[in-house]
């Protein structure tokens, strides 16, 4: 499929001008190669009319130009002084005309309307409102006022001052007679339909002395705005329908066959299943404008989208609308990222999030998509050291491995963590990706005690048992804080007895805290990694209490408290508005949630290893 994209149909009127924008993937080769606009012949072939290399056909001399915008990946063809002879099938493309790197464009130039003298032209968008003004003289002030529409050869009454309304206009038309002294009546038609277009006649009086005024109503179907986005990327549709529909239900729909427009999302709570987890309808402003964000773009998302306002939350005749034609470029620079990551209940997941490599200094974020209402994505963590309170001790965003990827680790998984999460940055908004976390049945591989209590001034040893599956990987302990997980020194020696059917390759790695202080209280993680890639993690909370009896503490799996109950998320938590996702700098206020716990002094912590039987009480 050609990655070149432009308007499928361009309509204009004789004597007018058109501007045609064609999009291409902005690779180095594409930016510099020849751009052309050619007309397709009846027997195939395409005759160049204008190109970026300076060629202009005699048919276009003095009335056309082609401008390349390499930084945008677009070029624009402007054609003036259009005639009906310009109607036909064209191609805009790159390279050689016959190579196939092109897009077909149909140009239709129609004759201008043959208007009667003294005709007032009203040009109004579909779904909007028109006011047709009709002047009259004093002698007709008390006489019947009427509006007719010319249907073929005959005028058909639309509305009059005696109360008649043509059934085609019921509920959306009124006739207003201005106050005395103003010799004017007006007809207001709402929710304009394409079928309303045509020639109208206002009349005051019915005899030979009546006043008449001709009006030509042109109802414009909105030209779709062209949107060119990368596969797996993100698109935002900004919809501004005007304050008159501020309180009417809004929708975004995708045109399918014929005139059908299938609702993608609306403000009444409807959402198409194909967009679950990857769409947000951002709250509307007072002026009735709103925006819809779709991430994880797929090939099948390409097509024509309409946004509109109607009490039913779907397209109806007379809905004011805005249109887009979305093209999804399959030659994407956005890497494939996982669409699903599965984790075992009680264990962890490590999610790799791609970002634009040119923006390594951008702030990274991770949010949880919520389907309630119109979809929202409250932040859970960022790369600046903020973690949502309910996720303390079990969520970390790491800049590793870098170079276009960051890592998010979430542990202590419960069924409540299943859902859709978004990776995003405060840089390129196109690089928003969605991942679904699924919780599967199974047992965590790493075995650690539940809650552990350390005694001030004493030594604490906490075991972590690694199965043989991880024999060839680096094992570590670290202390969690809101900026990451600071590694503690580690040694790996000795098999664990915690696994059945596991050979000598299993390992017991113990964390030793010498002379425990209050600063040692907090979450500790043990885990496996390979270079900058993280595998499973397990979390232990170490509480610190006053000395009761002298000695040191050695925690075994059996002795440790049971794992704490899963945290219940507070339903009243503050949420970041979706608008902030457009500009994550707006999240700054959330940073006020400071982590008051001190970081442990790494010099007093050590990790040692040994078999289960060898775990002595003394510190080394």
């Amino acid at each position: 499929k050609s990655p070149i994209f432009g308007p499928e149909e361009v309509n204009s009127v004789e004597g007018n001008s058109v501007s045609i924008t064609c999009y291409y993937p902005p690779t180095s080769v594409n930016r510099h190669t020849r751009k052309y606009w050619c007309r397709q012949g009846a027997r195939g072939g395409c005759i160049t009319l204008i190109s970026s290399e300076g060629y202009v056909s005699s048919k276009y001399a003095g009335r056309a130009n082609l401008t390349n915008f390499p930084e945008n990946g677009t070029f624009v063809v402007n054609i003036a002084q259009l005639s009906q002879d310009d109607s036909g099938r064209y191609k805009c493309g790159l390279g050689i005309n016959s190579r196939g790197l092109s897009f077909d464009v149909s140009l239709e130039v129609s004759q201008g309307p043959g208007l009667l003298n003294d005709t007032k032209v009203y040009t109004v968008d579909l779904g909007r409102t028109v006011t047709i003004n009709c002047p009259f003289k004093t002698e007709n002030a008390q006489k019947r006022k009427s509006l007719y529409k010319q249907i073929g050869l005959y005028p058909v009454l639309v509305i009059d001052s005696s109360g008649y309304v043509n059934p085609n206009y019921t509920g959306r038309i009124r006739l207003d007679i201005q106050g005395t002294g103003q010799l004017l009546f007006s007809v207001v038609i709402n929710q304009l339909r394409l079928s309303d277009a045509g020639q109208y006649l206002c009349q005051a009086g019915d005899d030979s002395n009546s006043n008449k005024k001709n009006a030509d109503l042109q109802v414009l179907k909105p030209e779709p705005e062209l949107v060119y986005e990368d596969l797996r990327g993100s698109v935002t549709f900004h919809c501004a329908l005007g304050p008159e529909v501020a309180n009417v239900a809004k929708f975004l729909c995708r045109q399918s066959s014929g005139e059908n427009c299938d609702v993608v999302v609306n403000t009444l709570g409807k959402r198409a299943p194909a967009f679950e987890g990857r769409i947000l309808l951002n709250p509307q402003d007072k002026d009735g404008s709103f925006s819809v964000v779709i991430t994880g773009l797929r090939k099948e998302d390409a097509g024509r989208y309409l946004c509109g306002a109607h009490s039913d939350g779907q397209l109806q005749e007379g809905s004011p609308i805005q249109a887009w034609q979305l093209f999804v470029n399959e030659e994407s620079t956005i890497p494939r990222s996982p669409t699903v990551v599965k984790g075992v209940a009680g264990s962890s997941v490590a999610v790799l999030c791609p970002y634009n490599r040119k923006e390594s200094k951008s702030i990274k974020y991770w949010c949880l998509w919520e389907g309630a209402q119109n979809g929202r994505c409250p932040l859970l963590v960022d790369s600046e050291g903020w973690v949502k309170a309910q996720y303390e001790g079990r969520l970390s965003l790491l800049e590793e491995p870098g170079n276009g990827t960051f890592t998010v680790i979430l542990n202590q998984l419960t069924s409540r963590d299943a859902g859709f999460y978004w990776c995003l940055t405060n840089g390129d908004t196109l690089w928003r990706t969605t991942v679904e976390i699924k919780i599967i049945e199974g047992e965590p591989n790493l075995k650690v005690p539940g809650n552990v209590t350390a005694v001030l001034g004493e030594t604490l040893k906490v075991p972590c048992h690694f199965p043989c599956k991880f024999s060839s990987y680096e094992k570590y302990w670290c202390k969690w804080n809101n900026t990451g997980c600071q590694a503690l020194p580690s040694q790996d020696e000795g098999p664990s007895k915690a696994f059945v059917n596991c050979d000598e390759n299993s390992r017991l790695v113990s964390l030793t805290l010498n002379l425990v202080t209050r600063a040692d209280e907090g979450w500790y993680w043990c885990g496996v990694k390979q270079g900058h890639f993280y595998g499973e993690t397990a979390a232990v909370y170490v509480a610190v209490e006053e000395r009761k009896a002298a000695g040191s503490r050695d925690v075994s799996l059996a002795k440790a408290d049971a794992a704490p109950d899963e945290k219940v998320l507070d339903s009243g938590f503050r949420e970041i508005e979706n608008k902030a996702i457009q500009d994550p700098r707006l999240f700054a206020e959330e940073k006020a949630v400071a982590d008051t716990r001190d970081q442990a002094d790494g010099s007093r912590a050590s990790v040692d290893s040994g078999s289960s039987e060898e775990q002595g009480g003394s510190s080394r």
Epitope: P335, R336, S337, V340, V341, K342, S347, V351, L352, T405
Partner: nanobody, 138 residues
């Protein structure tokens, strides 16, 4: 949807060899990690081996390590299990399974070790074949 069809099972004497194949059709084969499981009569389904989408990472159950080899040919949409030094306790129905692997086919990101995913649990996999019987006689 992904359809998986196993073949190559049969009766073999202890110490012998068999090569199982699993042909995949449907969605992009190269996006999926492929695993083999087995189920002996009256026992639970047991993990045997798994191979990452690229073939660059493999992981085996301890009971088959050194005797079985998993491999794949993405051009043929097929995964193989070469079973050598077979034992009577290897008798079971062998199932092929596939699960979408995070990061597959990404231009910029090297793949994570397959052990870092819970691929030894049947619930990790999205699609399953019907199975092929392997019987090892003593």
């Amino acid at each position: 949807q992904v359809q998986l069809v196993e073949s190559g099972g049969g009766l073999v004497q202890a110490g012998g060899s068999l090569r199982l194949s699993c042909a995949a059709s449907g969605r992009t084969f190269s996006s999926y990690a492929m695993g083999w499981f087995r189920q002996a009569p009256g026992k639970e389904r047991e993990f045997v081996a798994v191979i990452s989408w690229s073939g660059g990472s493999t992981y085996y159950a301890d009971s088959v390590k050194g005797r079985f080899t998993i491999s794949r040919d993405n051009a043929k949409n097929t995964v193989y299990l070469q079973m050598n030094s077979l034992k009577p306790e290897d008798t079971a129905v062998y199932y092929c399974a596939s699960g979408e692997q995070p990061g597959s086919n990404r231009p910029y990101i090297p793949e994570q070790p397959i052990e870092f995913m819970p691929t030894d649990y049947p619930s990790w996999y999205d699609y399953w074949g019907q199975g092929t019987q392997v019987t090892v006689s003593s």
